[in-house]
């Protein structure tokens, strides 16, 4: 399938001009290669009319140009002084020959319709309203006023000043006069449909002295806006329907032959195909709203329409906006697993891609919630503290320049199952959706910490050990201290020479962490984990409480937190990478609504880095060792 995209059908009238935009994939080669516009002949040959190399055919001389916009990955063909001879099939494309990558465009140029000389033309979009102005002479002021629509032989009444209204216009036609002007009456017709298009006659008075005026009403379907998006990226449909529908329910639907199937509306309807990857956000009181879809698939390509109606469904005669979405399969967004599986008590490491050109952008992880219009509250971010209910079990590891950041969630419960989004305050296309599935654990965890009831005594030495199976022997083991700014890896050293994995003793594989001497600041969550290079694997968590040497001193003993840490882990390693660079912290930015909100998070960011030292001062040593 060609990755070039443009308008399928373009229509205009004689003497007018057209502007045709064609899209191409974002690559250096594409930006610099030849762009062309050619006309298809009966033989299948496509004759070049204009190209970016400077070629211009005789029939386009002085009336056409082709402009490349490499920053937008588009090129535009402008053609003026159209004639009916320009009607035909064309291609816009890329390549040294006209057999390169291309998109078919049909151009239709119609004759200017012949209308009576005094005809006033009104051009309106479907669903909008029109106010027709009907002037008359003063002597016809007391007389009946009317508007009729011309049919083949007669003129069918629409409305008159005696409250007579054609049934098909009841509730949407009004006749009125304004101010003190006794020489004009007006007819307003709302909720326009294609059927309303045609010739009308305004009349004041009867017989030969009547005042008449011809009116031509053109009702147009809105021109679809073209959207060119990469596979796995995201798209935002910005819908602005006007104040008159501000209080109506809003919807987005996708054209399917004759019908338009609702994907989402503000009344709570949502197509299951878009579960976990769609949000509808009312913008203001003027009827503006947006729909965001992430994780674009091939089958998402098509014709979309937004609208407003109390039913939340498409309704004839109500305003609409349309788009043609093209999903480019030559995507720059890497193909990652969209489903990650974990088990209760276990952990998952999720790799989130971002635009490598924007390594300094702020990274976030949010949980998609489908209630209402759908929303995605941020759970953690490079400058957003971890949400309280995720204390001790969620961290984001940034890997600047690598194009991936990692989110680790441990102590999993079945309630963690659901959809999560990776997003940044930079390139909004790089939003990805992950579905997390959590099954009940059926075996012992891969990582186990002893002692399980971890209470350290102030000033003494305290050691905890993390047992791991032989399959993790060759992987790097680490301990880190969790804070709501991240999990800071503690310095480690190997205990004893490494044995070959063949003689791996299942019972003696452990990595220990020693606190010496224990201080009050040591209280908190610690993680034991494994990683291979920059790819994070499993983790387990333990809460270490610190108490005074004297017995009977009270401390909170988070038994269920520790109990949770020892439930089974499933061997589910998701490709990911990590940085030991500390995370920055600002107050949580709150629920994620749209790009602007995330952008604001970045704008507010304070450069107050957490301390970069993993070891601590005052002669205390914090270390982890592996056997």
């Amino acid at each position: 399938k060609s990755p070039i995209f443009g308008p399928q059908e373009v229509s205009s009238i004689e003497g007018d001009s057209v502007s045709i935009t064609c899209y191409y994939p974002d690559t250096s080669v594409n930006r610099h290669t030849r762009k062309y516009w050619c006309r298809q002949g009966a033989s299948g040959m496509c004759t070049t009319l204009i190209s970016s190399n400077g070629y211009l055919s005789k029939e386009y001389s002085g009336r056409a140009n082709l402009i490349n916009f490499p920053e937008n990955n588009t090129f535009v063909i402008n053609i003026e002084q159209l004639t009916q001879d320009d009607t035909g099939s064309y291609k816009c494309g890329l390549g040294t020959s006209n057999r390169g990558l291309s998109f078919d465009v049909s151009l239709e140029v119609s004759q200017v319709p012949e209308l009576p000389s005094d005809t006033h033309v009104y051009t309106k979009d479907i669903g909008r309203n029109v106010t027709i102005e009907c002037p008359f002479k003063r002597e016809n002021a007391p007389s009946k006023k009317s508007l009729c629509k011309k049919t083949n032989q007669s003129c069918e009444l629409v409305i008159d000043s005696t409250e007579k209204v054609n049934p098909s216009y009841i509730g949407r036609a009004k006749l009125f006069m304004k101010g003190t002007d006794l020489t004009v009456f007006y007819v307003n017709i709302s909720h326009l449909t294609h059927n309303d298009a045609g010739l009308y006659i305004c009349q004041a008075g009867e017989g030969p002295s009547a005042d008449k005026k011809n009116v031509d009403l053109q009702v147009l379907a809105p021109e679809p806006e073209l959207l060119y998006k990469d596979l796995r990226s995201s798209v935002t449909f910005e819908c602005d329907l006007g104040r008159e529908v501000a209080n109506e329910a809003k919807y987005l639907c996708r054209m399917n032959k004759e019908t338009c199937d609702v994907i989402i509306n503000t009344l709570g309807k949502r197509d299951p195909d878009f579960e976990g990857r769609i949000l509808i956000t009312p913008k203001d009181d003027n009827g503006r709203f947006s729909v965001l879809i992430t994780g674009l698939r091939k089958e998402d390509a098509g014709h979309y329409q937004c609208g407003a109606h109390s039913s939340g469904l498409p309704q004839e005669g109500w305003p609409i906006q349309t788009w043609q979405l093209f999903v480019n399969e030559e995507s720059t967004i890497p193909n990652r697993r969209s489903v990650v599986k974990g088990v209760t008590g276990g952990s998952v490491a999720i790799a989130c891609p971002y635009n490598p050109k924007e390594s300094s952008s702020l990274k976030y992880w949010c949980r998609w919630e489908g209630d209402g219009n759908g929303h995605c509250p941020v759970l953690v971010g490079t400058q957003a503290q971890v949400q309280e209910e995720y204390e001790g079990r969620l961290a984001l590891f940034d890997q600047p320049g690598n194009g991936t950041y990692t989110v680790i969630l441990n102590q999993l419960t079945t309630e963690d199952a659901g959809f999560y989004w990776c997003l940044t305050n930079g390139d909004s296309r790089w939003r990805t959706t992950i579905e997390l599935q959590v099954a009940e654990a059926t075996r012992e965890p891969n990582l186990e910490v002893t002692p399980q009831n971890a209470t350290a005594v102030l000033g003494e030495t305290f050691t905890v050990s993390c047992h791991y199976p032989c399959k993790f022997y060759s992987q790097e083991k680490y301990w880190c201290k969790w804070s709501n700014k991240g999990c800071h890896i503690l310095p480690s050293h190997d205990e004893g020479a490494r044995q070959s994995s063949v003689s791996c003793d299942q019972s003696s594989q452990l990595v220990s962490m020693t606190l010496n001497p224990v201080s009050k600041e040591d209280e908190g969550w610690y993680w034991c984990g494994v990683k291979q290079g920059q790819t994070y694997g499993e983790t387990t968590a333990i809460y270490i409480a610190v108490e005074e040497r004297t017995r009977g001193s009270s401390h909170v003993n988070p038994t269920d937190a520790n109990a949770r840490a020892k439930v089974a882990l499933e061997e589910e390693v998701v490709d990911s990478s990590i940085s030991e660079k500390e995370n920055k912290a600002i107050p949580n930015p709150g629920p994620f609504a749209n790009e602007r909100e995330i952008q604001n998070v970045g704008d507010q960011a304070q450069e107050n880095r957490a301390s970069g030292d993993a070891g601590s001062a005052d002669g205390q040593s914090r270390s982890s060792s592996s056997k």
């Epitope: 007389s143 005696t162 409250e163 009841i170 009125f176 006069m177 101010g179």
Partner: nanobody, 125 residues
Framework: QVQLVESGGGLQQAGGSLRLSCAAS????????VGWFRQAPGKEREFVAA????????YYADSVKGRFTISRDNAKNTVDLQMNSLKPEDAAVYYC??????????????????WGQGTQVTVSS
Amino acid sequence: QVQLVESGGGLQQAGGSLRLSCAASGRTVTVMTVGWFRQAPGKEREFVAAITMYGERTYYADSVKGRFTISRDNAKNTVDLQMNSLKPEDAAVYYCAARTYVSGIYDRFDDYNYWGQGTQVTVSS
């Protein structure tokens, strides 16, 4: 703006007659239709009759057809409601209403944008 003032209400015996009058002032050229509505205690406001200003046409509620007549006097800017064969159920406060557009729906009170203060009609049996 359009101002409306009703007059002619009062007490009348069943079978008798009354003539209500509605005087319009202000920007009366914009008035397209004038209607009479009534409201009895504890009941909804209901349509009685209407007349169009540009091209005379009259409309009546079924309950008053043949007994009430609506008419206008353009020179005086008045609209009258002649009520004959009055019945006890005709007793109510009668309101004159005007609207500055036509839409084919003349019998809904919320489609009228100007209202008078009302005049009381009492019918004794």
